[in-house]
């Protein structure tokens, strides 16, 4: 697909379903096939709200 060789810590087969280990503040992004900065999910105590702080998210309606 034209992507250059990835850094060693995140190299994986394009078809592999198991990413290699990322740093603690990172997670594996299958789209770019690399470790990237990752934000935490936040679960509000109350139900759906549209006044969350930036970078927060609701849990899915049908559950994880």
């Amino acid at each position: 697909m034209g992507a250059r060789r990835l850094r060693v810590r995140s190299q994986r087969s394009r078809d592999s379903s198991v990413p290699t280990q990322c740093n603690q503040t990172e997670c594996f992004d299958p789209l770019v096939r690399n470790c990237v900065s990752c934000e935490l999910f936040h679960t509000p105590d109350t139900g759906h709200t549209s006044s969350l702080e930036p970078g927060t998210a609701l849990q899915p309606q049908e559950g994880s």
């Epitope: 992507a3 990835l6 990413p19 992004d29 690399n34 990237v36 990752c38 934000e39 999910f41 970078g55």
Partner: antibody, heavy 125, light 107 residues
Framework: EVQLVESGGGLVQPGGSLRLSCAAS????????IHWVRQAPGKGLEWVAW????????DYADSVKGRFTISADTSKNTAYLQMNSLRAEDTAVYYC??????????????????WGQGTLVTVSS | DIQMTQSPSSLSASVGDRVTITCRAS??????VAWYQQKPGKAPKLLIY???FLYSGVPSRFSGSGSGTDFTLTISSLQPEDFATYYC?????????FGQGTKVEIK
């Protein structure tokens, strides 16, 4: 506040070149992937290219491969799209966007959360 | 490449209506689907990511569901500011691809 500002669009003749810039503020581009997405007049969204600025890894849509080059300067917190051999069908508004990732069992659940205002590229003689 | 097929391409609805837009992927994309809203002359805005997660600041009348190949965006009670074009996008694999868009117009 997270912000992306594109610049560099304009009118260019077929076969010509343009360099688009995407200046980011409020976050560090090396932490995310940066994408270019375009929209031809009256048409839908088409992804063009992405880069992970932390290591320069890139990928391109087949329609621009070999003609466009995406790059980033982390010291300037800016991404670029060098467009060569431009064609009439490249006429579009070009947006840069940040892909945000949320951690789901150490795998990204992500999308393009912040977009620039867009810059118009017109390829015409 | 993974094709994303949206339906309908356009629809007419009234304020207060429940609106459902569907998106079908040409192959399994797990839950790696986002939904965006775009108004004329403006950049797209993220509504839903990972198929069913409501993005920060988005009103709760928007919801998303689905996994695998079939996905749905629902607006529970259409508001005047919701008249726009909506796009789905898969980010399961490169190239990330968008649906062709659904224009929601005033009836």
């Amino acid at each position: 506040e997270v912000q992306l500002v594109e610049s560099g669009g304009g009118l260019v003749q077929p076969g010509g070149s343009l360099r688009l810039s995407c200046a980011a503020s409020g976050f560090t581009i090396s932490s995310n992937s940066i994408h270019w997405v375009r929209q031809a007049p009256g048409k839908g969204l088409e992804w063009v290219a992405w880069i992970t600025p932390s290591d320069g890894n890139t990928d391109y849509a087949d329609s621009v491969k070999g003609r466009f080059t995406i790059s980033a300067d982390t010291s300037k917190n800016t991404a670029y799209l060098q467009m060569n051999s431009l064609r009439a069908e490249d006429t579009a508004v070009y947006y840069c966007a940040r892909r945000v990732c949320y951690d789901r069992a150490r795998v990204c659940a992500g999308a393009m959360d912040y977009w620039g205002q867009g810059t118009l590229v017109t390829v015409s003689s | 490449d993974i094709q994303m097929t949206q339906s309908p391409s356009s629809l007419s609805a009234s304020v207060g209506d429940r609106v459902t837009i569907t998106c079908r992927a040409s192959q399994d994309v797990s839950t790696a689907v986002a939904w965006y809203q775009q108004k004329p002359g403006k950049a797209p805005k993220l509504l839903i990511y990972s198929a069913s997660f409501l993005y920060s600041g988005v009103p709760s009348r928007f919801s998303g569901s689905g996994s695998g190949t079939d996905f749905t965006l629902t607006i529970s009670s259409l508001q005047p500011e919701d008249f726009a074009t909506y796009y789905c996008q898969q980010s399961y694999s490169t190239p990330p691809t968008f649906g062709q868009g659904t224009k929601v117009e005033i009836k």
